[in-house]
């Protein structure tokens, strides 16, 4: 079935949400973010086999052409379908501010 | 500079729009599309080195974590930032119809 959630490569091998624990230093944020000191970063990782979580028609085309011309056309790629917001306490020219970032943490994933 | 368009890997090696000539058979559409018989498929192909066409903060995070944990976190991936529509003449149960698809052809690319 199209847009399937059953991974043919085995459990956990296909495109899905992963959580990676990271410090401000890991993220390269230590010079401008004060808090949080550590972040549970959610990101999209995994393979995109045929018909698995295909985002759209373009992803279907890409997979078909990848099968035909694997050296020219890469397979679809696992990327965020949407994001969860996150509030950072950050340094500013005038002091410190609260700021919402809409595109920091992946919420769910698909193949494009 | 962030979101740079200068490819550090050499001309044409980084994430950009490519055109791939494909027939209906190549696309797996021969059984339901009548026209066009051939399509100039625009898609996003290429590497995503640090700070190249970063789509958002998530892409920056992903690149930083990829540098730290390359076996766990993949590099950002070259995907469409937007699409161009395309009209297909397609077979239907009752005959033939014109249908616009908004997500077939990549218009521009970025790294996520």
């Amino acid at each position: 079935a199209r847009n399937g959630d059953r991974c043919p490569l085995g459990p956990g091998r296909c495109c899905r949400l992963h959580t990676v624990h990271a410090s401000l230093e890991d993220l390269g944020w230590a010079d401008w973010v004060l808090s949080p000191r550590e972040v549970q970063v959610t990101m999209c990782i995994g393979a995109c086999p045929s018909q698995f979580r295909e985002a759209n028609m373009h992803a279907q085309i890409k997979m078909n052409l990848h099968r035909l011309k694997p050296d020219t056309v890469p397979a679809p790629c696992c990327v965020p379908a949407s994001y969860n917001p996150m509030v950072l306490i950050q340094k500013t020219d005038t002091g410190v501010s609260l700021q919402t970032y809409d595109d920091l943490l992946a919420k769910d994933c698909h193949c494009v | 500079a962030r979101n740079g368009d200068r490819c550090p890997l050499g001309p044409g090696r980084c994430c950009r729009l490519h055109t791939v000539h494909a027939s209906l058979e190549d696309l797996g559409w021969a059984d339901w599309v009548l026209s066009p018989r051939e399509v100039q498929v625009t898609m996003c192909i290429g590497a995503c080195p640090s700070q190249f066409r970063e789509a958002n903060m998530h892409a920056q995070i992903k690149m930083n974590l990829h540098r730290l944990k390359p076996d766990t976190v993949p590099a950002p991936c070259c995907v469409p930032a937007s699409y161009n529509p395309m009209v297909l003449i397609q077979k239907t149960d009752t005959g033939v119809s014109l249908q616009t698809y908004d997500d077939l052809l990549a218009k521009d690319c970025h790294c996520v």
């Epitope: 808090s35 917001p85 509030v87 501010s97 609260l98 700021q99 919402t100 | -």
Partner: antibody, heavy 118, light 107 residues
Framework: DVKLVESGEGLVKPGGSLKLSCAAS????????MSWVRQTPEKRLEWVAY????????FYADTVKGRFTISRDNARNTLYLQMSSLKSEDTAMYYC???????????WGQGTLVTVSA | SIVMTQTPKFLPVSAGDRVTMTCKAS??????VAWYQQKPGQSPKLLIY???NRYTGVPDRFTGSGSGTDFTFTISSVQVEDLAVYFC?????????FGAGTKLELK
Amino acid sequence: DVKLVESGEGLVKPGGSLKLSCAASGFTFSSFAMSWVRQTPEKRLEWVAYITSGGDYIFYADTVKGRFTISRDNARNTLYLQMSSLKSEDTAMYYCTRDDGYLWFAYWGQGTLVTVSA
Amino acid sequence: SIVMTQTPKFLPVSAGDRVTMTCKASQNVGNNVAWYQQKPGQSPKLLIYYASNRYTGVPDRFTGSGSGTDFTFTISSVQVEDLAVYFCQQHYSSPLTFGAGTKLELK
């Protein structure tokens, strides 16, 4: 059920001081950032101050900076607002609000009225 | 700070009407706008957050839309119990700011 109960209302002369309290119950107080929001007699809503869950970061509206102090006692499940050098324009209903981490206000107390008048 | 300009100030309605009010931010706030309802003698109540997400228990006649600087709040079919003041708020950055409110009143 989440409950926020403000106290400390009063009539104060300009230049005077007043301390408001907010007793929280029905949730783990120490896990949430908190804010004070006030509503003027003209019914305008104004964010006043914000404090992180551990009290390590504090933010104020420019109109109250240097005069108001937000604090919390996580052991007592209580939020405070110490107001000094009060002005007539500080006259308002003061609400205690819980921040669920996204800078909007899903939970409000019933409010406590502060009147600054000679 | 970000100024939230809310219009109109007053909105005369009849039961069953579809009504729309708008909020304009002085700078891009993404989709970081919330809408609140306040009835006389009560505290404000959160209806919408992230411009279009309905808060728990809020009836589906209340909808929000918009992004960037222009936001809209709609009640598809006004009920008598919806007569109240509605406020928008940007939850993008400090200082957090509210619109001046739109009062829904009977025609």
